[in-house]
Amino acid sequence: LVPHLGDREKRDSVCPQGKYIHPQNNSICCTKCHKGTYLYNDCPGPGQDTDCRECESGSFTASENHLRHCLSCSKCRKEMGQVEISSCTVDRDTVCGCRKNQYRHYWSENLFQCFNCSLCLNGTVHLSCQEKQNTVCTCHAGFFLRENECVSCSNCKKSLECTKLCLPQIENVKGTEDSGTT
């Protein structure tokens, strides 16, 4: 099966790689603009240069293109705890991340919030904190795992999900999420 192509993809596929078909004259293939630039004017004819201009401050293109405008640079979301890892340049968007000892939680495909890595007090580190995953803690005896923190079994009330983790006969309790909730 041939995948469905949009009009722009159809037009581009007629020309060799690195070129695009002139929008007003489909017998002309123009050279695409380099990353960091955008299309100001199409090439006037075969073998003639495309008029490409450098992106202005606050905008970028990260690959060869025939865009009429550069893309706006992303801004890191301070209210999500994000920090700027690298600034926007004409050929690369801003890179946002989290501070040291923090991990990312994605609320959507493109939006993440930074959270502090758990320290595993009253427990031991089972798996270290990673870019997109909190530390996994194993709790000492007499403690249970709650939101990835080890909490004293004295805070465990009867009939709550911690009861099975705080049975006195269990010597070493490995904290787990309450069953059926993940």
Epitope: H105, F115, K132, N134, E147, N148, L160, E161, D178, T182
Partner: nanobody, 120 residues
Framework: EVQLLESGGGLVQPGGSLRLSCAAS????????MGWVRQAPGKGLEWVSA????????YYADSVKGRFTISRDNSKNTLYLQMNSLRAEDAAVYYC?????????????RGQGTLVTVSS
């Protein structure tokens, strides 16, 4: 047994308000980030809002900021979503969900949902 039971959905005119409730049983909501996820017809799940166990930290999707307010009553083990200035694009099934932090977007454990219809 862990259960989340949503209520408060219904038919409302554009510009109107609704308050959704989520009664939790089998676990204590004050221990967890909790939130609301929605799914519009023919679309995927999306996080609308979430709140930390203490209530001191919240998340709102850009599309609902300034219109929706999330809150919780830990003594009643209940989560709420006050929805004001409702728009046609807010129509969806709304699910109460336990947030599973890290990676994502993931939608953790959620209830059966309550339908919100916005129509004149």
């Amino acid at each position: 047994e862990v259960q989340l039971l949503e209520s408060g959905g219904g038919l409302v005119q554009p510009g109107g308000s609704l308050r959704l409730s989520c009664a939790a049983s089998g676990f204590t909501i004050e221990w967890y980030w909790m939130g609301w996820v929605r799914q519009a017809p023919g679309k995927g799940l999306e996080w609308v809002s979430a709140i930390s166990g203490s209530g001191g930290s919240t998340y709102y999707a850009d599309s609902v900021k300034g219109r929706f307010t999330i809150s919780r009553d830990n003594s009643k083990n209940t989560l709420y979503l006050q929805m004001n200035s409702l728009r046609a694009e807010d129509a969806a099934v709304y699910y109460c969900a336990k947030v599973k932090l890290g990676g994502g977007p993931n939608f953790g454990y959620r209830g059966q949902g309550t339908l919100v219809t916005v129509s004149s």
